[in-house]
């Protein structure tokens, strides 16, 4: 890492897949050597409970329910190894969900993906690209989030109730935009302001509902780094 | 301190030879990629070729590539361009430059570019009867 | 080939103007791991060239703050924010992204 410079922070949604970006800049006269390069991915854990053994998230077995600032600091250990023939090694069994996608890599695309992330795998990566006589690196911080769309009054709705839904993801900055859609047999359709559905931030407030509204509504809560998630929430409302 | 000295240019009658030397001295000459280019009066300047540190790969503009040869001598830190078949239009300034390795870093990941940093005072060649 | 196209041929400026060179490409210079291989080198009168910009935009050692670059694609643009008389010259881009390698035509900055 730079002097001075940030560990880049990525964002994923627990129980969605998670891509840990690591494109280090190769000239292009070098990219056939691309062919024999090899990676290494470590991590460090987030900190546990204080009272939970280390453990290790990408490893099988139980983990920590979850991260904290307090606690022993876990030891970093290997997720994923590739050798220049492709050879995949690391903690065993090694996961079918942490994968290294193979056409990426002979593009110089060395990306790690979680599929999906648990809330277990947060904390600090590192690669370590080998490329004949040199060595590259590449290093982040992944931190993970849960997506929730609530209710309010929860429950099942009478024709001419009022509803709020409301869009979350436990992330502490705010979406820089959401988008609320409503999922028809012919794909989403976008929800307006109209005097049925007024839009506030990550609100939504229905006046008062009818039948037709039961269904499948969702939003897409989109933030400044380029991260996105789609929520969903299906709405009863009784005849 | 870097420094790239050439040789070798003068006036050459059309379908003649003539080989160009680029000597470099302050610089470890066998981990570098050397790159020649040219300026011509009409058309700016060219892109000739390139090769890598060991000779094992040398890259060249299509249009050149069966007139020219790009070669290099480690154990004399010295860079060649020898030229064949040359026309009036091979009248030229010739430039030969080091590819220094830039180090770079982008979101997290630390890698590294390579671009001319280093030229030679240029050898002027003429083709002419 | 990838042909570079700089516009304009001449820009002709006084002393502590704003100038800036376009440069665009035939074909996207993103090359496959999703890097863009963009240089810009000037000529000064009577000497080789130097490197000013590499990778689209960032400058190199020793190059002031005044000259910037930006760009995507197929379209890159250099700035000089107030023009030196040591700036005069010829600017080129340099792409390296598809072999053959290819400069753009050269701008040429000269005093009003």
């Known amino acids: 890492l730079q002097p001075g410079a940030e560990v880049p922070v990525v964002w994923a949604q627990e129980g969605a897949p998670a891509q840990l970006p690591c494109s280090p800049t190769i000239p292009l006269q070098d990219l056939s050597l691309l062919r024999r390069a090899g990676v290494t991915w470590q991590h460090q854990p987030d900190s546990g409970p204080p009272a939970a053994a280390p453990g290790h998230p990408l490893a099988p077995g139980p983990h920590p329910a979850a991260p904290s600032s307090w606690g022993p600091r876990p030891r970093r250990y290997t997720v994923l190894s590739v050798g220049p023939g492709g050879l995949r090694s690391g903690r065993l069994p090694l996961q079918p969900r942490v994968q290294l996608d193979e056409r990426g890599r002979q593009r110089g695309d060395f990306s790690l993906w979680l599929r999906p992330a648990r809330r277990a795998d947060a904390g600090e990566y590192r690669a370590a690209v080998h490329l004949r006589d040199r060595a590259l690196s590449c290093r982040l911080r992944l931190r993970l989030g849960q997506a929730s769309m609530t209710a309010s009054p929860p429950g099942s709705l009478r024709a001419s109730d009022w509803v709020i839904l409301n869009c979350s993801f436990s992330r502490p900055d705010r979406p820089a935009s959401v988008h609320w859609f409503r999922n028809r047999g012919q794909g989403r359709v976008p929800v307006r302001e109209s005097p049925h559905h007024h839009l506030a931030e990550s609100f939504l407030f229905l006046p008062q509902v009818s039948p037709m509204d039961s269904g499948p509504w969702g939003c897409i809560l989109t933030y400044r780094d380029g991260f996105n998630v789609s929520i969903m929430y299906n709405l009863t409302v009784l005849g | 301190e870097v420094k790239i000295l050439q040789s070798g240019g003068g006036l050459v009658q059309p379908g003649g030879s003539l080989k160009l030397s680029c000597a470099a001295s302050g610089i470890d000459f066998s981990r570098y990629w050397m790159s020649w280019v040219r300026r011509t009066p009409g058309k700016g300047l060219e892109w000739i070729g390139e090769i890598n540190p060991d000779s094992s790969t040398i890259n060249y503009a299509p249009s050149l590539k069966d007139k020219f040869i790009i070669s290099r001598d480690n154990a004399k830190n010295t860079l060649y361009l020898q030229m064949s078949k040359v026309r009036s239009e091979d009248t030229a300034l010739y430039y030969c430059?080091?590819?220094?390795?830039?180090?770079?870093?982008?979101?997290?990941?630390?890698?590294?570019?390579?671009?001319?940093?280093?030229w030679g005072q240029g050898t002027s060649v003429t083709v002419s009867s | 080939d990838v042909l570079m196209t700089q516009t304009p041929l001449s820009l002709p400026v006084s002393l502590g103007d704003r100038a800036s060179i376009s440069c665009r490409s035939s074909q996207t210079i993103v090359h496959g791991n999703g890097h863009t291989s963009l240089e810009w080198y000037l000529q000064k009168p009577g000497q080789s060239p130097q490197l000013l910009i590499y990778k689209v935009s960032n400058r190199f050692s020793g190059v002031p703050d005044r000259f910037s670059a930006s760009g995507s694609g197929t379209d890159f643009t250099l700035t000089i924010s107030r023009v030196e008389a040591e700036d005069l010259g010829v600017y080129y881009c340099?792409?390296?992204?598809?072999?053959?390698?290819?400069f753009g035509g050269g701008t040429k900055l000269e005093i009003k």
């Open positions: 430059a080091r590819l220094g390795i830039i180090p770079t870093y982008h979101y997290g990941s630390s890698g590294y570019y390579y671009a001319m940093d280093y």
């Open positions: 340099f792409q390296v992204s598809h072999v053959p390698y290819t």
